[in-house]
């Protein structure tokens, strides 16, 4: 993830981003790019916009991509069928 600034909610981030938990410091949230093709994801990551405070360090996948299971407990952003 690219650090683009601290945040609390999605509304504080630019387009194509969400306010996700920092990989490095769990108490901090940072504006993080939405998942690209091949990125790891979680299928229950809240869609953008989310008005609460996220718990995951990943954002949802970009439009046109879906968070799909590739093996047990592993999910990746892939093109929607």
């Amino acid at each position: 993830a690219v650090i683009t600034g601290a945040c609390d909610k999605d509304s504080q981030c630019g387009g194509g981003m969400c306010c996700a938990v920092s990989i490095w410091v769990k108490s901090i949230r940072i504006c993080t790019p939405m998942g690209k093709l091949g990125d790891s994801c979680h299928p229950l990551t809240r869609k953008v916009p989310f008005f609460g405070r996220r718990m995951h360090h990943t954002c949802p996948c970009l439009p046109g991509l879906a968070c799909l299971r590739t093996s047990f407990n592993r999910f990746i952003c892939l093109a929607q069928k």
Epitope: H42, L44, M55, N73
Partner: antibody, heavy 121, light 111 residues
Framework: EVQLVQSGAEVKKPGASVKVSCKAS????????MHWVRQAPGQGLEWIGY????????TYNQKFKGRVTITVDKSTSTAYLELSSLRSEDTAVYYC??????????????WGQGTLVTVSS | DIVMTQSPDSLAVSLGERATINCKAS??????????MNWYQQKPGQPPKLLIY???NLESGVPDRFSGSGSGTDFTLTISSLQAEDVAVYYC?????????FGQGTKVEIK
């Protein structure tokens, strides 16, 4: 004060459809998702699905896929559950419940009073 | 689907004593260091009430005699000192994978 007020009890014949409403008040309706859960008489809880009250996006329990439709009317702050092709096993109390917005820890912090749907020939 | 199994099915505890309810998931409900497990209380004729979210976080307004613990597949709800108003059915719920599934419930009564 957050309140979820559901429509009244329904009696339906097998094969029919039912639509239950849930009117929300006391908070910003579009900022929270709404879940639907049911409870058969004397039984446990079963999650049906939820909807984003912001953009109408839905996630359903696959068990109900094709028979259930969850919608919202933002103008009246009301969520709806429609269940079709009813069978006797659908006899239950149906609850709407607001998502608590605790990040990805989906949790239901306010519940409607429940709507009893009875399916009987 | 993830199957949630609670034990015991029912529990009789003296007033002021500790009550412990267990919940076992058929697979891990952890993700990214968090446990995606909730606990609810339901009294007769009422809707459920959220007690604990994300395994160990006490919902606002819930007495601190309630606590949740556990990770992975094994979770516990503890009532440190049972009060008369705690007589109810308690449900665990996993929210790590759709469909969100509940345990079958544990009935807590006064001995």
């Amino acid at each position: 004060e957050v309140q979820l007020v559901q429509s009244g009890a329904e009696v339906k014949k097998p094969g029919a459809s039912v639509k239950v409403s849930c009117k929300a008040s006391g908070y910003s309706f579009t900022d929270y998702d709404m879940h639907w859960v049911r409870q058969a008489p004397g039984q446990g809880l079963e999650w049906i699905g939820y909807i984003s009250c912001y953009n109408g996006a839905t996630t359903y329990n696959q068990k109900f896929k094709g028979r259930v439709t969850i919608t919202v009317d933002k103008s009246t702050s009301t969520a709806y559950l429609e269940l079709s092709s009813l069978r006797s096993e659908d006899t239950a109390v149906y609850y709407c419940a607001r998502d608590a917005n605790y990040g990805e820890a989906y949790a239901m912090d306010y519940w409607g009073q429940g709507t009893l749907v009875t399916v009987s020939s | 689907d993830i199957v949630m199994t609670q034990s015991p099915d029912s529990l009789a505890v003296s007033l002021g004593e500790r009550a412990t309810i267990n919940c076992k998931a058929s697979q891990s409900v952890d993700y990214d260091g968090d446990s995606y497990m909730n606990w609810y209380q339901q009294k007769p004729g009422q809707p459920p009430k959220l007690l604990i979210y994300a395994a160990s976080n006490l919902e606002s307004g819930v007495p601190d005699r309630f606590s949740g613990s556990g990770s992975g597949t094994d979770f516990t709800l503890t009532i440190s000192s049972l009060q008369a108003e705690d007589v109810a059915v308690y449900y665990c719920q996993q929210i790590n994978e759709d469909p969100f599934t509940f345990g079958q419930g544990t009935k807590v009564e006064i001995k």
